[in-house]
Amino acid sequence: AGVFELQIHSFGPGPGPGAPRSPCSARLPCRLFFRVCLKPGLSEEAAESPCALGAALSARGPVYTEQPGAPAPDLPLPDGLLQVPFRDAWPGTFSFIIETWREELGDQIGGPAWSLLARVAGRRRLAAGGPWARDIQRAGAWELRFSYRARCEPPAVGTACTRLCRPRSAPSRCGPGLRPCAPLEDECEAPLVCRAGCSPEHGFCEQPGECRCLEGWTGPLCTVPVSTSSCLSPRGPSSATTGCLVPGPGPCDGNPCANGGSCSETPRSFECTCPRGFYGLRCEVSGVTCADGPCFNGGLCVGGADPDSAYICHCPPGFQGSNCEKRVDRCSLQPCRNGGLCLDLGHALRCRCRAGFAGPRCEHDLDDCAGRACANGGTCVEGGGAHRCSCALGFGGRDCRERADPCAARPCAHGGRCYAHFSGLVCACAPGYMGARCEFPVHPDGASALPAAPPGLRPGDPQRYL
């Protein structure tokens, strides 16, 4: 058992051009919080699979209000660590997802509004009990800097938190079958809960419920002495039951090396020679190789034949990240020409073209719509020597016949919230704005200071339109 700890150092714009807009504004202050999700790294899990190792949510950070005109700085962070307790052994290799969430604090309908700002993911090797590991991850134009570690909860110790330690009962040495807890030489490994009845003097276990015998003893509970031929190479205390020297436990007894590692004694302890793909004091930590399938979402793994050489994931279209764990915002590449609206549908990219343009990427300039009526309130206008349909909001296509999800085109300006109705849509304006689509600031130089329905100002018509 133990705790995975995550410390967020900073969240802000990454280096290079295209700095992101501040997620908060004078009109709409907000605060950040973080979510971490951990999964055992060797399981072939999709990015959407449950957080099998655990998850945690941070506290809310301080309220942040953007200073107009200033570039987006590193944003104020919540205090404290994110802690994810784990009950069983630490797997050594794990995958993580860290999400940065924004909580808007304006006058929201139905309480605060939450939205996901950034998500980073990765797969790492980490031994429990080690120092803090630092990391930097980027999500779009944002950059997240953080540190993490796994630590065992007493009495567990070791790189996987599977060994148990207790203070020594005797000052000189540990009890039978128990090794010193390096590096805590003043503590001893504590016995696991072995099979009921397992001899505390002559039996031990590496897994709960088993009973393995020290040399010179046998039987299901290690209570039966073997023949005195075991006294031929004496080393250890005298046994009262056999009248000869029963060999005491050597450091390699019971083979402490996991995962097929071979044990050799050293003057002070033991050393494990690990098979390929494993490392650690007892070969308990697995290295990530292509054989482990580290690439999500159908990514192709190249290289990484052994744990010490890096693997590279070649991601399929639509995914990116060192493990193909991030979905590409393909619209950020602005593939739609001539002012077309980009829609990333997941399985495909779609451009909703402005009036007068067509084609998969709105690349075709339609010559003429003369002689055609523009449907749904669209108007035929001159433009560049040709007639085109200029469509009303919510409609598109050559003749304005294509009906869109009324909220898909973000029809509410200045942070207004769109609600689709059977009759069309409604814009709920942020404080200090009004109009059918919240397009009019009431006081342009102080919009945030006004209530949602400022005194002395009323719309002439209901704010519901097709």
Epitope: G339, R354, A355, G377, T379, V381, G383, S390, A392, L393, R410, A413, G435, A436, R437, E439, F440, P441, P444, P459, G460, D461, Y465
Partner: nanobody, 117 residues
Framework: EVQLVESGGGLVQPGGSLTLSCAAS????????LAWYRQAPGKKRELVAG???????YYAESVKGRFTISRDNAKNSVYLQMNSLRAEDTAVYYC???????????WGQGTLVTVSS
């Protein structure tokens, strides 16, 4: 980008009338929401009247019944007809356009209206 040019400001006596015009350089004024704002000396700029892309109109309580906003899509223009003018209507009047094409607000340079006897 949208360029806005106001005209029609000037000196007028209390009770008089004036019409402000704003011409927008834009391929289709139907994709603009248009408004008039004013800023009196030492005061915040405030919305006087607005007309959405769909024709719905908005007025400040202080001008209701006296001012009328209208648009002429063929001429890419918006107008503010001001009747029964009062001294407190003295201000610089600004034309405003919100472009639904690029989701940006645009402002004119302003035209001064002075109501004085």
């Amino acid at each position: 980008e949208v360029q806005l040019v106001e005209s029609g400001g000037g000196l007028v006596q209390p009770g008089g009338s004036l019409t402000l015009s704003c011409a927008a350089s834009h391929s289709s004024v139907t994709s603009l929401s248009l408004a008039w704002y004013r800023q009196a000396p030492g005061k915040k700029r405030e919305l006087v009247a607005g007309i959405s892309y769909d024709g719905s109109k908005y007025y400040a309580e202080s001008v209701k019944g006296r001012f009328t906003i209208s648009r002429d899509n063929a001429k890419n223009s918006v107008y503010l007809q001001m009747n029964s003018l009062r001294a407190e209507d003295t201000a610089v009047y600004y034309c405003y356009a919100y472009s639904w094409t690029d989701r940006l607000p645009y402002w004119g340079q302003g035209t001064l209206v002075t109501v004085s006897s």
